[in-house]
């Protein structure tokens, strides 16, 4: 995932004696937290691969790009980045690979300029519905986030709560309608089996949606109709068998869309006829000439664009009286 890029400015490492004893006071303008590297010129702080167990309290007020990757944060509490004075210019926050398993309500409150958040590669067993909205109001203040990167946040099977992981993530995305301004959402590699039907309708500003490398079997109940601005939809490496007419028509109706469908186990039987016809005509599918059948066995590796209706048959279903037990 793309993260806040740093410029080539020199970084100053903090001196080891700058302990967190002064953390309750406003940080000095040039102070750099222990175990971090700071560049005031680039407005960047990097606390990377330091096994930190909590967010440093003495972050410099100038920070715009904050890397807290490769740590052991475990829990992100409410107001984890709330400071006095606030981190008013923090725009890009990368927390990827920091062993976070819980993000609590209001974890990102008091970050008025936060545009990009990357929580990828954390086993988020407990993502509060109010992690991004900050409050449990039915309509929250709009979040400043425009890019939210949540790739590979699924916890191991044995660490999951007794609830749908998809539902937990979607609840956080929809709470308080705070993410109405979200333009880029990455949800790749999360073992999603389905997409709750209401999620996309409530993210009307989306331009880029990455659902690649999940386990989506069908899009039948997903509506793309409201996503009139959507520019790219990544569905590569899922478990899609066929796209039905309703989905095809909705995708075709999106004026700017590019759809990526590579590496899905397409089932080339009679139900595939509409999709094949659509593929031959549409320009929205990128790399459509690479799409191949996975099933039935006799059709394996056949190119979808080269199929005709005669190739797409369904084995007749025997009437009940002729079926053997």
């Amino acid at each position: 995932s793309s993260s806040p890029t740093s410029s080539a400015s020199s970084f100053s490492s903090s001196a080891p004696f700058l302990a967190s004893a002064v953390s309750a006071q406003p940080p000095l303008p040039d102070q750099c937290p222990a175990l971090c590297e700071c560049s005031e010129a680039a407005r960047t702080v990097k606390c990377v691969n330091r096994n930190l167990t909590e967010v440093p309290t003495d972050l410099p007020a100038y920070v715009r790009n904050l890397f807290l990757t490769g740590n052991q944060l475990a829990v992100l509490p409410a107001g984890a980045f709330a400071r006095r004075p606030p981190l008013a210019e923090l725009a890009a926050l990368n927390l990827s690979g920091s062993r976070l398993d819980e993000v609590r309500a209001g974890a990102f409150e008091h970050l008025p300029s936060l545009r990009q958040l990357d929580l990828s590669h954390n086993p988020l067993a407990d993502l509060s519905p109010f992690a991004f909205s900050g409050s449990n109001a039915s309509v929250s203040a709009p979040s400043p986030l425009v890019e939210l990167i949540l790739n590979h946040i699924v916890p191991p099977e044995d660490e999951r709560q007794n609830r749908s992981f998809e539902g937990m993530v979607v609840a956080a995305l929809l709470a308080g309608r705070a993410l109405q301004g979200l333009r880029r959402l990455e949800l790749a590699s999360n073992h999603f089996l389905y997409l709750p039907r209401d999620v996309l309708a409530q993210l009307p500003s989306l331009r880029h949606l990455d659902l690649s490398n999940n386990s989506l079997v069908s899009l039948t109940y997903v509506s793309f109709r409201n996503l009139t601005h959507l520019e790219s939809l990544h569905l590569e490496d899922n478990a899609l068998k066929v796209l039905h007419n309703g989905t095809l028509a909705e995708l075709q109706g999106l004026p700017h869309i590019r759809v990526f469908l590579d590496n899905n186990p397409w089932v080339c039987d009679c139900h595939m006829a509409d999709m094949v016809t659509w593929l031959k005509e549409t320009e929205v599918v990128q790399g459509k000439d690479r799409l191949t059948c996975a099933y039935p066995e006799k059709m394996r590796n056949r190119v979808l664009l080269e199929l005709n209706s005669a190739d797409l048959d369904c084995d007749p279903i025997l009437p009940p009286s002729l079926q053997t037990s």
């Epitope: 793309s2 993260s3 890009a92 520019e231 790219s232």
Partner: antibody
Framework: QVQLQQSDAELVRPGASVKMSCKVS????????IHWMKQRPEQGLEWIGY????????TYNEKFKGKATLTADKSSSTAYMQLNSLTSEDSAVYFC?????????????WGTGTTVTVSS | DIQMTQSPASLSASVGETVTITCRAS??????LAWYQQKQGKSPQLLVY???TLAEGVPSRFSGSYSGTQFSLNINSLQSEDFGIYYC?????????FGAGTKLDLK
């Protein structure tokens, strides 16, 4: 440092097409959207559209649909804009510019500009 | 489309003076506004984004502020290198649009 180097000035005939380039250096090309702007002499700036080099997606200002085509080549870290069916109204300086991220939509680094003159 | 109305169209000032340029959006754009400076024959340069955040390397004599749909760029103690054309641009939704520009020249 981050740089966007645009191709040289073009003198073209009415009705012809032109393809200009914007070669970037100093950062990862696929992390930032590239936008294109038009500026006519003594006039303001108009946004043409953008392309996200990571997957080639993007969008156009309705006014420039059919006039401009944006592409990107990841292997050479170069964005391109083709303008077709040129008229005198297309005589302008064209700038590429880097988005602050992928979808921030402000422009933190601008290219050097390519002057297009349409004349018979 | 969101219209950006910039004023004044031109402005004369002396070195050391303070000047303010304003921009009004035709609808709510929150703090999604940027300011650029362009000198004759050069490319524009980003000064401010998110209405108030100074871009990297921009001197602190520049500042941005806003209230509702009205945005301002303030330049304290003008320097000789500050003369040129200033543009506002909203970054709230597409199509992205610019103000018509304010030409700041030496009195």
């Amino acid at each position: 440092q981050v740089q966007l180097q645009q191709s040289d000035a073009e003198l073209v005939r009415p009705g012809a097409s032109v393809k200009m380039s914007c070669k970037v250096s100093g950062y990862t090309f696929t992390d930032h959207t590239i936008h294109w702007m038009k500026q006519r002499p003594e006039q303001g700036l108009e946004w043409i559209g953008y392309i996200y080099p990571r997957d080639g997606s993007g969008t156009y200002n309705e006014k420039f649909k059919g006039k401009a085509t944006l592409t990107a080549d990841k292997s050479s870290s170069t964005a391109y804009m083709q303008l077709n069916s040129l008229t005198s109204e297309d005589s302008a300086v064209y700038f590429c510019a880097r988005d602050g991220s992928s979808h921030y939509w402000y422009f933190d680094v601008w290219g050097t500009g390519t002057t297009v003159t349409v004349s018979s | 489309d969101i219209q950006m109305t910039q004023s004044p169209a031109s402005l004369s000032a002396s070195v050391g003076e303070t000047v303010t340029i304003t921009c009004r959006a035709s609808e709510i754009i929150y703090n999604y506004l940027a300011w650029y400076q362009q000198k004759q024959g050069k490319s524009p340069q980003l000064l401010v984004y998110n209405a108030k955040t100074l871009a990297e390397g921009v001197p602190s004599r520049f500042s941005g502020s806003y209230s509702g749909t009205q945005f301002s760029l303030n330049i304290n103690s003008l320097q000789s290198e500050d003369f040129g054309i200033y543009y506002c641009q909203h970054h709230h939704d597409t199509p992205l649009t610019f103000g018509a520009g304010t030409k700041l020249d030496l009195k």
